[in-house]
């Protein structure tokens, strides 16, 4: 998958993929931080949530996010039996009924209130990277990842495999 031009045909199938089952295979709470150890925080402002990327003061509590992991099964593919079909998808919810959404038109990451079943914009393909970091690729737009831009989360297009290790799309998960 990896959202890279050489395998776009493969990743594009994510557009048509269905989430197998309606319940996640596992879920747990974790704090989200950038490769450079800045925290991702969520603040309620004027009845909507804002997302910030910031340095926390010493002993300041990190915001937790509920990560729900699903298996994505591609529809029938060349090999015929779904062997290419399993990707690990994740949704991220910092507070009840709100989920991170990819707004591909605005290249932004937003918090939307919604009911299940969640829209495709709330699902991200999880990639394990070096140094135990992860990256989040938009299900609706392969090759586009959640990243950090100007102290905010944004959608960032990654157009070559070398750029997959770019620090601004790498995140750390911590349960503590």
């Amino acid at each position: 998958a990896f959202g890279i031009s050489g395998v776009q045909k493969y990743t594009r199938a994510l557009h048509d993929s269905s989430i197998t089952g309606i319940s996640p295979i596992t879920e747990y709470l974790a704090s989200l931080s950038t490769y450079n150890d800045q925290s991702i925080t969520f603040a309620l402002e004027d009845e909507s949530y804002e997302i910030y990327v910031e340095d926390l003061k010493k002993d300041e509590k990190k915001d937790k996010v509920l990560l729900s992991y699903y298996e994505s099964q591609h529809p029938s593919n060349e090999s015929g039996d779904g062997v290419d079909g399993k990707m690990l998808m994740v949704t991220l919810s910092p507070t009840k009924d709100f989920w991170l959404h990819a707004n591909n038109k605005e290249h932004s990451v937003e918090l939307h209130k919604c009911e299940k079943p969640l829209p495709d914009q709330a699902f991200f393909v999880l990639h394990n990277m070096h140094s135990n970091c992860v990256s989040f690729e938009c299900k609706t737009d392969p090759g586009v990842f959640i990243g950090v831009k100007d102290n905010h989360l944004a959608l960032i297009k990654v157009d070559s495999s070398e750029n997959l290790c770019t620090e601004n799309i790498l995140f750390k998960l911590s349960e503590t």
Partner: antibody, heavy 122, light 107 residues
Framework: QVQLVQSGAEVKKPGASVKVSCKAS????????MYWMRQAPGQGLEWMGW????????NYAQKFQDRVTMTRDTSISTAYMELSRLRSDDTAVYYC???????????????WGQGTLVTVSS | DIQMTQSPSSVSASVGDRVTITCRAS??????LAWYQQKPGKAPNLLIY???SLQSGVPSRFSGSGSGTDFTLTISSLQPEDFTTYYC?????????FGGGTKVEIK
């Protein structure tokens, strides 16, 4: 169906290098990380590292960092693991494996090669 | 590195018995644990992933449970082909590490 077929058994002298191949078929080779493990006779399993066949990016276990090189040839859907400066305690069966998920190791190793016995003896 | 401690290292049981193998991680690994069965001279075979999800094609007598640091593989009713070695593996963080193995032997 998915198959990982490894090269045959090797006998090497201490100090030499060995290169094991793993030919993948039945799936999109560039869509899944490839992992390498080894198992010494009568012992448990040990993870050595992984390669992203799409980018060529690698990640090695600290223990093997200075002796292992993982490469791939996408044109023939084959991954390689080369271990240099062999010692007698490198005698083991070496396995390649594909993860359950394309780019995440969270789901464990779903498909394995048949294993390649490497014997290091003077 | 995360150490995986499997117990017991061996267990004697009879066909039809219920067998439980435990695996403890030296630090929390959420639910990212896999269980494998390995027969002599063969590659390991994935039984359980994400601590409790049964791999396709694996008989339902195998089940997994646990989260955090403590995990269990249960074989509800041992069959003759189940007498072999089982490994747990943490799939949470690098380096990926395996337990030392549990050999299930015929009593």
């Amino acid at each position: 169906q998915v198959q990982l077929v490894q090269s045959g058994a090797e006998v090497k002298k201490p100090g030499a290098s060995v290169k094991v191949s793993c030919k993948a078929s039945g799936y999109t080779f560039t869509g899944h990380y490839m992992y390498w493990m080894r198992q010494a006779p009568g012992q448990g399993l040990e993870w050595m590292g992984w390669i992203n066949p799409n980018s060529g990016g690698t990640n090695y276990a600290q223990k093997f960092q200075d002796r292992v090189t993982m490469t791939r040839d996408t044109s023939i859907s084959t991954a390689y693991m080369e271990l240099s400066r062999l010692r007698s305690d490198d005698t083991a069966v070496y396995y390649c494996a594909r993860g359950r998920y394309g780019s995440s190791w969270y789901g464990g190793f779903e498909y394995w090669g048949q294993g390649t016995l490497v014997t290091v003896s003077s | 590195d995360i150490q995986m401690t499997q117990s017991p290292s061996s267990v004697s049981a009879s066909v039809g018995d219920r067998v439980t193998i435990t695996c403890r991680a030296s630090q929390g690994i959420t639910s990212w644990l896999a269980w494998y069965q390995q027969k002599p001279g063969k590659a390991p075979n994935l039984l359980i992933y994400a601590a409790a999800s049964l791999q396709s094609g694996v008989p339902s007598r195998f089940s997994g449970s646990g989260s955090g640091t403590d995990f269990t593989l249960t074989i509800s009713s041992l069959q003759p082909e189940d007498f072999t070695t089982y490994y747990c593996q943490q799939a949470y963080s690098l380096p990926l590490t395996f337990g030392g193995g549990t050999k299930v032997e015929i009593k």
